[in-house]
Interface confidence: low
């Protein structure tokens, strides 16, 4: 009869940029050889080549030199295709078409996502807020796919639906960044939540900001700086802010401006004489020039990393002088985690199996949790371990011991908590004898 | 400290190859690109190809397409080049560069001198 | 394939003059553009990355500038340790390919 192809029924799930395989497989007989063996993978919409094999030989990529099969696998009957540097532009489906003596074909769907990052909020207006007054809050997440879902609520947890105005824009690469704006009319003092969720990665990103209505104190130079820690991802750029009132008739040649380190009192940058004298924190630092007479002397940090994670204290001196400390947590995503089975051969109802939760480069360091089908947690015979490479990225692997029903499903969650971030992977195990990854 | 160690000098006749390696110490070897450069005596800089041994891609200038091969054992992180068909024009210093974040190489390795003469 | 050329070949300049070394590319290269020192016999130093960021323990008196075709590297009082052959060099955006300058030597006037 006709060649049995087999894919994964559910979609492929890749974040950008990272590299994903498009399981393939297919039952080779005895005494076969790749000189028998053509291979497409092809679009399953428009036809266009991907990637192939013929003539005992890989033809190559014809998809922007991205794909890759496994060329010492494809003599056993896997036809996987690896997919690299995934793009937005690449989710689809993809059709894996092997041909022997006859032929046949499956088709594998790949959805790609990108995690949002923790939103930002900003007011409008920022300063001498009293109750009564009307305020814009704007929710801001960026470089995420697909759309998001947003959602406001206040600090009793109550959802606040009037007043929202959502728009998603896509970039080049297809990401979305997402602005919610909300507007609301002050009490005495209020907590406005922003989540954002991405529909795929059931990922959950939120924000939010205590308003406290008063009026400011005079005197010493007042210098604010947000009370929540400003939280950045590992590589991005974090902005620390810090903002100062000028009086009537301030010119830059008054400003002396000083952050530095508040533990260690470690110079980070400075601007006096009227002039920036520059980073002395690794060149990674940069003031906003054209604001700082209008009182902004935030600091931009460049290329973030875990090492930069404490306080910094912003000091500013007119002729009065002020400072304050802001905190900067670092934070970077776990990957969606990968599954392990072991045994992965000839399970039977009654074995012992381990199955190994495994996610990567995540900061700061996860919660792991296990459950079955039924959302019943499993705590015991759970061992997991993080460590933290040379940058302070943990790796995060997780192992359950657990006696095989006649089926079930284990899932494992990896929760940053910072970001609030879920990963979660899981896998079901069916049926007698069975074997894992199933084989063709 | 981050530290770029290569192997030592190497006579090779022509239409032969040469393969150089690269052993890094200090700092996470997968996550920084490794780039390899050349410098024949009395010219220029010239970069013939570079890995980022994390995503195991390898990316190549034109000039030497086809007959370099750039790599990386991550579990001994060590980057290696070979270069084929050798000519005497191939004579150089070859250097491994490693970036501190990113692509520009900060650290470079101690060169290695790669005589191609019949 | 994008070409870089830099001028002028040879600068002969005295200690504490200002040394002005041009780098133009081919085309646009944003500002994925650095600039490397190299002494006889010895390895390249990377100075300036992204067209006027200053790598780690590189003095002040380098300085970087540029974008697009045309980039400056600055030293704005030679000091003696200064006398070198510089390199610039583009990335591009992906695949990372690079191109070095043909150099250009600062000597002793």
């Known amino acids: 009869g006709a060649l049995e192809v087999q894919v994964p029924e559910d979609p492929v799930v890749a974040l950008v940029g990272t590299d994903a395989t498009l399981c393939c497989s297919f039952s080779p007989e005895p005494g076969f050889s790749l000189a028998q063996l053509n291979l497409i993978w092809q679009l399953t919409d428009t036809k266009q080549l991907v990637h192939s094999f013929a003539e005992g030989q890989d033809q190559g990529s014809a998809y922007a030199n991205r794909t890759a099969l496994f060329p010492d696998l494809l003599a056993q009957g896997n036809a996987s295709l690896r997919l690299q540097r995934v793009r937005v532009a690449d989710e689809g489906s993809f059709t894996c078409f092997v041909s022997i003596r006859d032929f046949g074909s499956a088709a594998v769907s790949l959805q790609v996502a990108a995690p949002y990052s923790k939103p930002s909020m900003t007011l409008e207006p920022n300063k001498d807020l009293r109750p009564g007054d009307t305020v814009t809050i704007t929710c801001s997440s960026y470089q995420g796919y697909p759309e998001a879902e947003v959602f406001w609520q206040d600090g009793q947890g109550v959802p606040l639906t009037g007043n929202v105005t959502t728009s998603q824009m896509a970039n080049e690469q297809g990401l979305f960044d997402v602005h919610s704006i909300l507007r609301v009319v002050l009490g005495a003092n209020g907590t406005y939540s922003c989540l954002v969720r991405n529909p795929v990665l059931q990922q959950d990103a939120h924000s939010s900001v205590t308003i406290t209505p008063q009026r400011s104190p005079t005197g010493a130079v007042e210098v604010q700086v947000p009370e929540d820690p400003v939280v950045a991802l590992v590589g991005t750029d974090a902005t620390l802010r810090c903002s100062f009132s000028p009086e009537p008739g301030f010119s830059l040649a008054q400003l002396n401006l000083i952050w530095q380190l508040t533990d260690t009192k470690q110079l980070v940058h400075s601007f006096t004489e009227g002039r920036d004298q520059g980073s002395a924190y690794a060149n990674r630092t940069a003031l906003f020039p054209d604001l700082l007479a209008q009182g902004n002397a935030s600091l931009r940090l460049q290329r973030v990393r875990v090492a930069d994670e404490g306080s910094f204290t912003c000091f500013v001196s007119i002729r009065d002088f002020g400072s304050a400390a802001v905190s900067l947590q670092v934070a970077a995503p776990y990957s969606k985690p990968s599954m392990t089975l072991e045994p992965n051969k000839d399970l039977r109802p009654g074995d012992t199996v381990t199955i190994t939760c495994s996610s990567y480069r995540g900061y700061p360091e996860a919660e792991v949790f296990w459950q079955d089908g039924q959302g019943v947690p499993l705590t015991g015979n759970v061992t997991t371990s993080q460590m933290a490479n040379e940058q302070g990225l943990f790796d995060v692997h997780s192992v359950l011991r657990v006696v095989l029903g006649a089926n079930g499903t284990y899932s494992c969650l990896v929760r940053n908590p910072v970001l609030q971030q879920d990963a979660h992977g899981s896998v079901t195990i069916t049926g007698q004898p069975m074997t894992f990854p199933p084989e063709a | 400290q981050v530290q770029l160690v290569q192997s030592g000098a190497e006579v090779k006749k022509p239409g032969s190859s040469v393969k150089v390696s690269c052993k890094a110490s200090g700092g996470t070897f997968s996550s920084y690109a490794i780039s390899w450069v050349r410098q024949a005596p009395g010219q220029g800089l010239e970069w013939m190809g570079g890995?980022?041994?994390?995503?195991?891609?390898?990316n190549y200038a034109q000039k030497f397409q086809g007959r370099v091969t750039i790599t990386a054992d991550e579990s001994t992180s060590t980057a290696y080049m070979e270069l084929s068909s050798l000519r005497s024009e191939d004579t150089a210093v070859y250097y491994c560069?490693?970036?501190?974040?990113?692509?520009?190489?900060?650290?470079w390795g101690q060169g290695t001198l790669v005589t191609v003469s019949a | 394939e994008i070409v870089l050329t830099q001028s002028p070949a040879t600068l002969s300049l005295s200690p504490g003059e200002r040394a002005t070394l041009s780098c133009r590319a081919s085309?646009?290269?944003?500002?994925?553009l650095a600039w490397y020192q190299q002494k006889p016999g010895q390895a390249p130093r990377l100075l300036i990355y992204d067209a006027s960021n200053r790598a780690t323990g590189i003095p002040a008196r380098f300085s970087g500038s540029g974008s697009g075709t045309d980039f400056t590297l600055t030293i704005s009082s030679l000091e003696p340790e200064d006398y070198a052959v510089y390199y610039c060099?583009?990335?591009?955006?992906?695949?990372?390919?690079?191109?070095f300058g043909p150099g250009t030597k600062v000597d002793i006037k």
């Open positions: 085309q646009s290269v944003s500002t994925y």
């Open positions: 060099q583009q990335r591009s955006n992906w695949p990372p390919l690079f191109t």
């Open positions: 560069a490693r970036g501190d974040s990113g692509y520009d190489s900060n650290y």
């Open positions: 890995i980022i041994p994390i995503l195991g891609i390898a």
